[in-house]
């Protein structure tokens, strides 16, 4: 008789999840020699330990503490790039601007990027069929709690000028319910962070509006100012040209507005 299994509303654990996490850890330590002290098998064991045999709606930040400890990493605190709803461009930017880091450029962010995972209460099985959806099922699921935990730690580590890339094509350029809006904004440390600089990325070719005047950006400015952090905002009218100019800053066309 097949055992009854909880049916969740979200997609199940990414196939080859254990193999992918282990392989990513090995790749990361190859690419970042400063992280060679990390034992990838221990990292996987700690990752697994955070959610295996636990009810996937009952996960806490505490569950991830062993993994957080193993993945402790120092990134230059003044070189942090946050993003909201525009991950690909943020990653293209840090690929070129090598001294800046998104969360996914850190070991823990890299391990989990684009993956889904969950277990089942009282069994050591990984659930490849379905996992809880944040809205439809529960917010304290393994994936959401992981990102909340690492995002909070990443924001807490930031200092000086922190940059955030925002998607100007969305109805809510700044969304209070995004990870940036609900976690990172509230965990920037006013005693360390001087300024949050928002880069609003335009989508349309002919879009010359000043999206820094958008009501949601004004809302972000208000939240940040109340936290005693300065706020500045720049329009990035041509993201393609922006990236090109990061690659080749001496190009003559890079002096004009991008």
């Amino acid at each position: 008789v097949p055992r009854w299994r909880q049916q969740w509303s979200g997609p199940g654990t990414t196939k080859r999840f254990p193999e992918t996490v282990l392989a990513r850890c090995v790749k990361y330590t190859e690419i970042h020699p400063e992280m060679r002290h990390v034992d990838c098998q221990s990292v996987w064991d700690a990752f697994k330990g955070a959610f295996i045999s636990k009810h996937p709606c009952n996960i806490t930040e505490e569950d991830y503490q062993p993994l957080m400890k193993l993945g402790t990493q120092t990134v230059p605190c003044n070189k942090i790039l946050l993003w909201s709803r525009i991950k690909d461009l943020a990653h293209q930017f840090t690929q070129v601007q090598r001294d800046m880091f998104t969360l996914e450029d850190t070991l823990l962010g890299y391990l989990a990027d684009d993956l889904t995972w969950c277990g089942e209460f009282n069994t050591s099985k990984i659930n490849y069929q379905s996992c809880p959806d944040w809205r439809k099922d529960c917010s304290n699921n393994p994936v959401s709690v992981f990102w909340k935990t690492v995002s909070r730690r990443f924001a807490e580590a930031a200092c000086d000028v922190v940059h955030v890339m925002l998607n100007g094509s969305r109805s809510k350029i700044f969304d209070k319910n995004s990870t940036f809006g609900s976690v990172e904004v509230h965990n920037l440390q006013p005693e360390k962070v001087q300024t949050l600089e928002a880069w609003v990325i335009h989508g349309g070719r002919e879009d010359s509006r000043d999206l820094c005047q958008d009501p949601t950006i004004k809302e972000l400015e208000s939240i940040i100012s109340k936290r005693n952090i300065q706020f500045s905002c720049k329009n990035i009218y041509r993201p393609d040209k922006f990236l090109q100019c990061v690659k080749n800053p001496e190009d003559s066309s890079c002096t004009s507005e991008i």
Epitope: R16, E19, A23, V26, K27, I31, P33, Q95
Partner: antibody
Framework: QMQLVQSGAEVKKTGSSVKVSCKAS????????MNWVRQAPGQALEWMGW????????DVAQKFQDRVTITRDRSMSTAYMELSSLRSEDTAMYYC?????????????WGQGTTVTVSS | EIVLTQSPATLSLSPGERATLSCKAS??????VDWYQQKPGQAPRLLIY???NRYTGIPARFSGSGSGRDFTLTISSLEPEDFAVYYC?????????FGGGTKVEIK
Amino acid sequence: QMQLVQSGAEVKKTGSSVKVSCKASGYTFTDSVMNWVRQAPGQALEWMGWIDPEYGRTDVAQKFQDRVTITRDRSMSTAYMELSSLRSEDTAMYYCARTKYNSGYGFPYWGQGTTVTVSS
Amino acid sequence: EIVLTQSPATLSLSPGERATLSCKASQNVDSDVDWYQQKPGQAPRLLIYKASNRYTGIPARFSGSGSGRDFTLTISSLEPEDFAVYYCMQSNTHPRTFGGGTKVEIK
């Protein structure tokens, strides 16, 4: 079994470009960083750069920064190394190579090599 | 970048003799040094990883030692198939770098 199979020998003119391919099989292509190493006749080995096939992120040795582009095609499990503005000193054997989990960060796996000859 | 200096450039020995190859790094590379053997017309073959670990299938006559800046590859008793060029490589710091090689030839 694990294999890295490279494209055939190339003869190129000075100033032109060459694109060498490395087809991986016998393992999950995205699970390992792919490195490129070259060796001029009678000379030592020289590391050129790597690509993370999962995301396409690359790093290239300073010496080759302006001339080397490393790419991949995930659907074909193939990595590519393109070298532009060829000069006679680029005449060499070009290898792709990768590490193996639990074997440090050395390269136990190598392609058979691709000979590139640059002539004026 | 880290420079690896291998010595001697050539080692002339007879089968059965002991070969000692040196690799010196221009700065500390911890234990992140690997040794390769290369024969004419062939790709390099990994012998030793992380300074002292023999790779799978490598005969026990090959051993590696050292850490920091000084590394040694020892072949306890040379077999006819061991005459080749040997390279050290460091993976501690980007870019990876190789030594200039030591040719072990038959005396």
